[in-house]
Structure formats: structure tokens, C-alpha cells
Interface confidence: low
């Protein structure tokens, strides 16, 4: 992502366009790398990540990775370029506005991953696609 000493302004945003020719701005994502988590056996969870980060490249999307093994549960939140694999998996749902978790095969652990392309969309990770995100408690997001 952008080095913190670089001031982003209206004038120096990288000019990248989407398929329709519209200017595409870098994504805002939760970006706490790997943190221990208490998210378990729930239809959805908030990331509890206090950091909203501006992705370095306009094409990057938000990613969340939930992992559970015999010792702990972790949640990873990052920006990532969907053209590149992450944890050896393709980000097949990168265009989704919501972060819908999908299980991936990893030996020795339970591994779920999601990606999405709306601002801070990896703050609310969803394990059940029918989950209704209108719960007002979900709006009490932790950030600065």
C-alpha cells in the first residue's frame, strides 16, 4: 500500500480506468494483517480491525482470510491484486461488493477466504450468503 509519507491528493491520484472508462480510485480496505480472532460458529463477524488503509494500486481489492487450527483462530485483512494468487488461491470473487467467505482446502486447518471490491468491505465477513447486513450494530465500525 501507499508509503505513509506520500500525500495522496486530488492531483496525484494514479489515473486508472475501469472497463467503462471511468476513473478508478484506490480501494479502502481493512488492513491489520494477521490478528487473533474470536470469530467462530457465526453467520458473520466484524473484523475488529482498527485500521482503514488505502490500497497502493487502484486494481487492488479487499481480502479477508479466516483460519482455525487446534491452537487458535486468526483473521487476516489486507489489500491484494486479484490478478495474483493469495495463499496460493485465485481471488475469484474479487468483484463482489460483500466479503462472502468460501472454504479452501488447506491441510491441518480450516481455511476460509473472501475478497470484495467496495470500501472497507472486508470489515464484515460473511459465512452465510443469506445473512442480512442491515443489523445496525454492524455500523459501529472501529476505525480512525
Amino acid at each position: 500500500t501507499i508509503p505513509p509519507h506520500v500525500q495522496k491528493s486530488v492531483n496525484n491520484d494514479m489515473i486508472v480506468t475501469d472497463n467503462n472508462g471511468a476513473v478508478k480510485f484506490p480501494q479502502l480496505c481493512k488492513f491489520c494483517d494477521v490478528r487473533f480472532s474470536t470469530c467462530d460458529n457465526q453467520k458473520s463477524c466484524m473484523s475488529n480491525c482498527s485500521i482503514t488503509s488505502i490500497c497502493e494500486k487502484p486494481q487492488e481489492v479487499c481480502v479477508a482470510v479466516w483460519r482455525k487450527n487446534d491452537e487458535n483462530i486468526t483473521l487476516e485483512t489486507v489489500c491484494h491484486d486479484p490478478k495474483l494468487p493469495y495463499h496460493d488461491f485465485i481471488l475469484e470473487d474479487a468483484a463482489s461488493p460483500k466479503c462472502i467467505m468460501k472454504e479452501k482446502k488447506k491441510p491441518g486447518e480450516t481455511f476460509f477466504m473472501c475478497s470484495c471490491s467496495s470500501d472497507e468491505c472486508n470489515d464484515n465477513i460473511i459465512f452465510s450468503e443469506e445473512y442480512n447486513t442491515s443489523n445496525p450494530d454492524l455500523l459501529l465500525v472501529i476505525f480512525q
Partner: antibody, heavy 121, light 107 residues
Framework: QVQLVESGGGLVQPGGSLRLSCAVS????????MSWVRQAPGKGLEWVSS????????HNTDSVKGRFSISRDNSKNTLYLQMNSLRAEDTAVYFC??????????????WGQGTLVTVSS | DIQMTQSPSSLSASVGDRVTITCRAS??????LNWYQQKPGKAPKLLIY???SLQSGVPSRFSGSGSGTDFTLTISSLQPEDFATYYC?????????FGQGTKVEIK
Amino acid sequence: QVQLVESGGGLVQPGGSLRLSCAVSGFAFRRYAMSWVRQAPGKGLEWVSSISASGDRTHNTDSVKGRFSISRDNSKNTLYLQMNSLRAEDTAVYFCAKGLASSGKNYFDPWGQGTLVTVSS
Amino acid sequence: DIQMTQSPSSLSASVGDRVTITCRASQSISSYLNWYQQKPGKAPKLLIYAASSLQSGVPSRFSGSGSGTDFTLTISSLQPEDFATYYCQQSYSTPPTFGQGTKVEIK
């Protein structure tokens, strides 16, 4: 040049209301979370409230919940703090600050010059 | 909430002195620790972010170190413009909290 300019402070009676504004220029305001931080006379810094870049999410310190409301107008590059049911302990200089988070690091920078709110009868 | 405790609350030093200010968090905050300088009647100014990264434009005599719960701000050779109050702030979790400040005065 990045600038944050607060206004709207003044003397108000306990129970009264004020609306602070922070006019922003020099950066892409709509891309950043913004915050209010206050400083009581002769005291330290206290975070008050934050709002997401799009304005749909807010978070407040416990002591102002139900009384203060943060908002923003991205078309006007302006941040607001609506303060109701003011108390003597809300007397402070109120700073607006840009929240910049990159590479997983987070801090307040830069800050406005501050506006003084005095709650007294 | 995470409590941040700075020491000392104030100190007197001379130009050219090496000054060290410490900040302790009530729980581990990894390296999510920032340092600010504030002069009377002015807004705080970011000096150090992420415990040890120097903000652009800040003189190299300022440095930060530490991780977990214990952090240090060091001014290697105090200059006249460095007399001010310094605050640490954790950004590990909400609410972001500040230390009570350390006032650096002229001896």
C-alpha cells in the same frame, strides 16, 4: 498545501448546543476517515469521534455518545461535529484531524489549528 | 480501553542534551504507537508513527523504539525548537488513547 480549518466554537451555557465545522483543502477529502480530538485547558489529548470516508459509519467516545454527532459533506470538503446537551466538562479546544492509514499503520495527521468551546453559565 | 502512561510527566534539559521519554501501554499494542509534539497554542504534530518510523519532514534527531507494551521517544541532541509537550498514542484498538503528555522544559 493541506489545510484543515475549524470554526464554530464559542461560549455556550450548559445544556446548550454548538456545531463545529472543519473546512478541508489540499487532499482528496472523500478518500479519508476523519476525526475530532479535544484538549481541555491545561490537559492532554482525548479522541472524541471519527467518521468513515463515505460518511456511513461513525464511532464516538463513551462520554459523548447520544450527545455529539459527527458528519461530513464530501461535496463541500467539510467535516462537522454537532454537540448537544453540552456540559462543563466538554470545555476544550476541538481539533479536527485527518486519519491516514497506509501499509497497516495508522495515525492522526495533519491537524487543524483548533476551535475553543467554553461551556459555562 | 487501553491506558497509556508516559514518564516522566515533565523534565528539564539543556540544548544539546539527549532526552528520553517512555510510554507504557496497559496491554500489548504490537507496534501501533505514534508520537506527537505540541507547542503552546498550537495543534499537535506527528513525529513518529508505527513506533519507529519517522514522519516526513521531521528531523532525524527524533527516533522511536519499542514494541508490545514499552516504547521510547529519543531526542538525540535537544534543540531550542524542541521544547514542547510530547504525547504517545496507541492505534491498536478503538478508542485510540493518548498518554498524559511529557513537558520538556528549558533547564
